[in-house]
């Protein structure tokens, strides 16, 4: 229940990607506004997003103090220009939100190629270690950072003159693989973790193959 | 509870073609890479291939790169391995795997394909 | 291709012995190994992954051990339920590749 003229959120929904993460709901707000509220489990409720008319609160500044605890989030609905107006029970119409965990939950996002290079028949291919917004000692920590060796990533590669794939893995952020002399190669990775049983893979990385501009040669 | 169930198998002449199918319960293939293993009588276990059914790529033993095809009908949360040209030495128990990326932590029972004329 | 060589390929032991699988990978495989069981007519179950990680639900009495290229399964104490066969497998980089077997049989 609540005042005749509010209704409650609804589709309470938490979309996160190494950690940024936002909750969204709906509905589009009719004379009405929202305010978020954040708490771990334990803890004490925080406001974020007073009185806004968006459908989206920003909670990243929140979820990073503590990636691995778990999070659940409150989306109050007041009339348009009476905020102390409460419901029928005395307090203001409200929602909530599943429970978060982002250290198990966050989706993986996109990873990205940082460079390769031949020497002889072994090439070295290197993730770029993306910079989270979880911090530590005043510096933002990267996703390896974050997730240690629970982190892997998958290498497809295949010659650029045939279409059969290879795969390999590695804990750390770079691949050092066999290839046949004077072949060009094509390269895609894939962030994974094994242990989630949720979110565990990362969509591929965009292709790069030998002879662009990311690679460098040595006999 | 995670179940994968194989299907398909059966008495193939050779030369001829067989697919078969792992249906899934339990979980989704998308979040997994799905593998095809298999075991000829009194042997070892054999790498076929395997499928990241949510993207699509499919990686395989180049020894069945020819004849091999793995797909996923993820609608229908089942992970497919078709083989072509079979011979006599193809006769095996194949079973479908699925891989957390560290370990296969559930395999189906298998399904027997009998290649002989 | 990595070639997997394990040995032995059989062995008779009796319950409460302790009892060691090796496994040699042609290169490093960086500890991308892992070790299964199988009993007959069953599908296989894993025991060790990452070459000396225990798998959930799996009795202490196993463990894994090695790095590189040597790869250690050790049965502290064999008991009824242990006579299988057992297989290491690498997965590092394609094609997948798993040792011959090792038979484990009642002395």
């Known amino acids: 229940s609540g005042t005749t003229n509010t209704v409650a959120a609804y589709n309470l929904t938490w979309k996160s990607t190494n950690f940024k993460t936002i909750l969204e709901w709906e509905p589009k707000p009719v004379n009405q506004v929202y305010t978020v509220q954040i708490s771990t489990k334990s803890g004490d409720w925080k406001s974020k997003c007073f009185y806004t008319t968006d459908t989206e609160c920003d909670l990243t500044d929140e979820i990073v103090k503590d990636v691995k605890q778990t999070y659940l989030a409150r989306v109050f609905s007041y009339p348009a220009g009476n905020v102390e107006s409460t419901g029928s029970a005395g307090e203001p119409l409200y929602e909530n939100s599943p429970e978060f965990t982002p250290y198990l939950e966050t989706n993986l996002g996109q990873p990205t190629i940082q460079s390769f290079e031949q020497v002889g028949t072994k090439v070295n291919v290197t993730v770029e270690d993306e910079r989270t917004l979880v911090r530590r000692n005043n510096t933002f920590l990267s996703l390896r950072d974050v997730f240690g060796k629970d982190l892997i990533y998958t290498l497809y590669y295949w010659k650029s003159s045939s279409s059969g794939k290879k795969t390999a893995k590695t804990n750390t952020n770079e691949f050092l693989i066999d290839v046949d002399k004077g072949e060009n190669y094509c390269f895609s990775v894939q962030a994974v973790i094994p242990s989630r049983t949720v979110n565990r893979k990362s969509t591929d990385s965009p292709v790069e193959c030998m002879g662009q501009e990311k690679g460098e040669f040595r006999e | 509870e995670v179940q994968l169930v194989e299907s398909g198998g059966g008495l193939v002449q050779p030369g001829g073609s067989l697919r078969l199918s792992c249906a899934a319960s339990?979980?989704?293939?998308?979040?997994?890479?799905m593998h095809w293993v298999r075991q000829a009588p009194g042997k070892g276990l054999e790498w076929v291939g395997l499928i990241d059914p949510e993207q699509g790529n499919t990686i395989y033993d180049p020894k069945f790169q020819d004849r091999a095809t793995i797909s996923a009908d993820n609608s229908k949360n089942t992970a497919y391995l078709q083989m072509n040209s079979l011979r006599a030495e193809d006769t095996a128990v194949y079973y479908c795997?699925?891989?957390?990326?560290?370990?296969?932590?559930?395999v189906g029972q298998g399904t027997l394909v009998t290649v002989s004329s | 291709d990595i070639q997997m060589t394990q040995s032995p390929s059989s062995l008779s032991a009796s319950v409460g012995d302790r009892v060691t699988i090796t496994c040699r990978a042609s290169?490093?495989?960086?500890?991308?190994l892992n070790w299964y069981q199988q009993k007959p007519g069953k599908a296989w179950k894993v025991l060790i992954y990452?070459?000396?990680s225990l798998a959930e639900g799996v009795p202490s009495r196993f463990s894994g051990s090695g790095s590189g290229t040597d790869y250690t399964l050790t049965i502290s104490s064999l008991q009824p339920e242990d006579f299988a066969t057992y297989y290491c497998w690498q997965h590092g980089e394609s094609p997948w590749t798993a040792g011959q077997g090792t038979k484990v049989e009642i002395k």
């Open positions: 990452y070459a000396t």
């Open positions: 795997a699925r891989d957390t990326a560290a370990y296969f932590d559930y």
């Open positions: 290169r490093d495989i960086k500890s991308y």
């Open positions: 339990g979980f989704n293939i998308k979040e997994y890479y």
